[in-house]
Interface confidence: medium
């Protein structure tokens, strides 16, 4: 499984990711159990975060991992939990935030110099899939899809942002994780009020690039809380 690969330090030796832009299905998006995706303004945020159930890390966002919410808890009840920052304890790579990996039980910085920042996502615009596109094999050995192309380029399937080339991050698209461009100044970003609220979202945006942060656009300050437009702006 992917988890077993993430558990090892072989993460840096991944074969070229699968290629692919994921699609964005239908207007009405819902998550069982009974969660309806918010409609209306496409820059809405979700105020009331509901824990997102999961079975594998790949079903969570790129800044989350799948685990039992309580230490030693029932393994059958797992949710997406916020990733662990540098120097925090870990058991596998997926537990560490983008740009870090698990080494000797501690999250440490990846060798590659990748952009920092939270993964930005959009609620109603598109789909992201856990794109495991691995027909039951370890990612180290066999990738079953026919969509091989150069490692890390835009559209390639990825596990973490460190799998993508510079200027790209790994974000969900129609239930697949693919390399997408890091956001530039002026581009729309998504700022979640609650960590992990992306559990209800299909498509993710990348985070803002170096020297930029996701802030409310100045002329949108008067807008209602739910429709404030955020863009990448200089610090």
């Amino acid at each position: 499984t992917l988890n077993s690969v993430l558990n090892s330090n072989a993460i840096k030796n991944l074969p070229p990711p699968l290629g692919g832009a994921a699609g964005h299905p239908g207007s009405a998006v819902s998550a069982a159990p009974g969660i309806l995706y918010p409609g209306g303004n496409k820059y809405q945020t979700i105020d009331n975060y509901q824990p997102y159930p999961c079975a594998e890390d790949e079903e969570c966002g790129t800044d989350e991992y799948c685990a039992s919410p309580t230490r030693g808890g029932d393994a059958g009840v797992q949710i997406c939990l916020a990733c662990r920052k540098r120097r925090k304890r870990c058991m596998r790579h997926a537990m560490c935030c983008p740009g870090n990996y698990c080494k000797n039980g501690i999250c440490v910085s990846s060798d590659q110099n990748h952009f920092r920042g939270e993964i930005e996502e959009t609620i109603t615009e598109s789909f992201g899939n856990d794109h495991s596109t691995l027909d039951g094999y370890s990612r180290r050995t066999t990738l079953s899809s026919k969509m091989y192309h150069t490692k890390g380029q835009e559209g390639s399937v990825c596990l973490r942002s460190s799998d993508c080339a510079s200027g790209l991050c790994c974000a969900r698209h129609f239930w697949s994780k693919i390399c997408k461009p890091v956001l530039k100044e002026g581009q729309v970003c998504t700022k979640h009020r609650r960590k992990g609220s992306h559990g209800l979202e299909i498509f993710q945006r990348c985070y803002c690039g170096e020297g930029l942060s996701c802030r409310i656009q100045k002329d949108h300050h008067q807008a209602s809380n739910s429709s404030r437009l955020h863009t990448c702006q200089r610090h």
């Epitope: 079903e59 027909d135 559209g155 697949s176």
Partner: antibody, heavy 116, light 107 residues
């Protein structure tokens, strides 16, 4: 070899119901999102909806929202499309397809005719 | 919904001809864009994904280009088996939408 085989199509009266099935083989079904796409006679392709790998999430086109339900049984490698309150404009060949970075494998399609 | 406008709706060409089909989206779809080929009575087949990447097994005479709103499918030298209907599709926004199709016929 990857194969998708739809079944369950046929003639149904307006307002009626039908359940389509799509039997998958040759790949690890539970690793892929799946979609339904339809094509009215002599017309183009229309996306119907999609379902996430574990069936936790679904999405639908406005034209079928509230009437159609997509589900999957990963233990049986089968995708379903439950169609209720059928209308004449739902007449089409219905295809199930596997999603990767595009719809890379399609079934042969099953014809649904809604007519009185 | 994003509207996909394909042109031309049909064209006649000869074997060996260079054929270009264009597709315009009503708003930007980045590069999350696919091309499909469909022959009468058959299911569509994926040709190009992510705007320009050739799907495995597809002959190299097919190529895709474009980003944003304008995309192109080119067949460098038309072969007898290429006479079919071609559809573009965006996968950047919900719902996934297709162009109306371009039928490539024998001149």
């Amino acid at each position: 070899e990857v194969q998708l085989l739809e079944s369950g199509g046929g003639l149904v009266q307006p307002g009626g119901s039908l359940r389509l099935s799509c039997a998958a083989s040759g790949f690890t079904f539970n690793k892929y999102p799946m979609m339904w796409v339809r094509q009215a006679p002599g017309k183009g392709l229309e996306w119907v909806g999609a379902i996430q790998q574990r069936g936790l999430k679904t999405a639908y086109a406005d034209s079928v929202k509230g009437r159609f339900t997509i589900s999957r049984d990963n233990s049986k490698n089968t995708l379903y499309l439950q169609m209720n309150s059928l209308r004449a404009e739902d007449t089409a060949v219905y295809y199930c397809a596997r999603w990767t970075s595009g719809l890379d494998y399609w079934g042969q399609g099953t014809l649904v005719t809604v007519s009185s | 919904d994003i509207q996909m406008t394909q042109s031309p709706s049909s064209l006649s060409a000869s074997v060996g001809d260079r054929v270009t089909i264009t597709c315009r989206a009503s708003q930007s779809v980045d590069r999350y864009f696919n091309w499909y080929q469909q022959k009468p009575g058959k299911a569509p087949k994926l040709l190009i994904y992510s705007a320009s990447f050739l799907y495995s097994g597809v002959p190299s005479r097919f190529s895709g280009s474009g980003s944003g709103t304008d995309f192109t499918l080119t067949i460098s030298s038309l072969q007898p088996e290429d006479f079919a209907t071609y559809y573009c599709s965006q996968s950047t926004h919900v719902p996934l939408t297709f162009g109306q199709g371009t039928k490539v016929e024998i001149k």
